[in-house]
């Protein structure tokens, strides 16, 4: 059984204010069963950026259809980028548990930074 890897290919993503940013995340295995969430930052204070199951994320859309059983692409798009969006973003796999899901593995993170405006 292949051990799950969380792949975030870009270490650094330069974005432009007002544009849409795509944060890539793919997994190498469908197991263990459980959701993938997106966070900004690390530690107790990390901010929830996207949770497929619940929550309000008006500026976030998924690149793929996460409801498909064999989906392995958990990339997201964040629209209308502002300077307040800079930071390091992590996709994190949780293992389905009872009563609560348990964090299983995190991607290495993608740092989103503002790039120069196109001239």
């Amino acid at each position: 059984e292949e051990e799950l890897q969380m792949i975030q290919p870009e270490k650094l993503l330069l974005v432009t204010v007002g544009k849409t940013a795509t944060l890539h995340c793919t997994v190498t295995s469908l197991l263990p069963v459980g959701p993938v969430l997106w966070f900004r930052g690390v530690g107790p204070g990390r901010e929830l950026i996207y949770n497929q199951k619940e929550g309000h994320f008006p500026r976030v859309t998924t690149v793929s259809d996460l409801t498909k059983r064999n989906n392995m692409d958990f990339s997201i798009r964040i629209s209308s980028i502002t300077p307040a969006d800079v930071g390091t973003y992590y996709c994190v796999k949780f293992r389905k548990g009872s009563p609560e899901n348990v964090e299983f593995k995190s991607g290495p993170g993608t740092e989103m930074a503002l790039g120069a405006k196109p001239s």
Partner: antibody
Framework: DVQLVESGGGLVRPGESLRLSCAAS????????VTWVRQAPGEGLEWVSL???????YYADSVKGRFTISRDNSKSTLYLQMNGLRAEDTAVYYC???????????WGLGTLVTVSS | EIVLTQSPGTLSVSPGERATFSCRAS??????LAWYQQKPGQAPRLLIY???TRATGIPARFSGSRSGTEFTLTISSLQSEDFAVYYC??????????FGGGTKVEIK
Amino acid sequence: DVQLVESGGGLVRPGESLRLSCAASGFTFTNYAVTWVRQAPGEGLEWVSLISVTGTTYYADSVKGRFTISRDNSKSTLYLQMNGLRAEDTAVYYCAKVTWKNVFDYWGLGTLVTVSS
Amino acid sequence: EIVLTQSPGTLSVSPGERATFSCRASQTVGSKLAWYQQKPGQAPRLLIYDANTRATGIPARFSGSRSGTEFTLTISSLQSEDFAVYYCQQHTDWPPYTFGGGTKVEIK
């Protein structure tokens, strides 16, 4: 505008219990960790407890086993259940929103807890 | 646990003057240090994080710097509303989140 409003403070005797609430508005409560910080009369700030967006809880050693932090995302409310209260728990209790940088960017006005016989 | 020591305990400054006070960490915290301002009867307010990044809405007269484990908050020209207690907080090693004991800036 972000608002945090604490309630539930009051005067209790040593050994008794109290439940503090913090009603949050002006931000998406479910997306952020929230915390309690206290300040004894004339003293500095002391971090008490934090609950993450996934529900993981953290406590200062001074309150571990006596205090329980919880959140109700449907009500955008943070709670602190305080049992076995001691005189040294007397303080103003503030709730605060936690940023992804692990700093506290918005604070409530606080609620006073007095433990005295 | 990281211990933060603030000095001086009290600083007497005249309005318009420069105020500088420090926070020393017992071990390395990188640049992960924040400063808060608290006026009497009010909640603390976040001023600076990451040692030198001003929080939203904080005036440019507030600036932070770092030299190893010693951090400094400078108020370039004290306004009447700046007389308050200032606390540092480390945000690299948690839990616990630790605060310094505070520096009171009073009118000279």
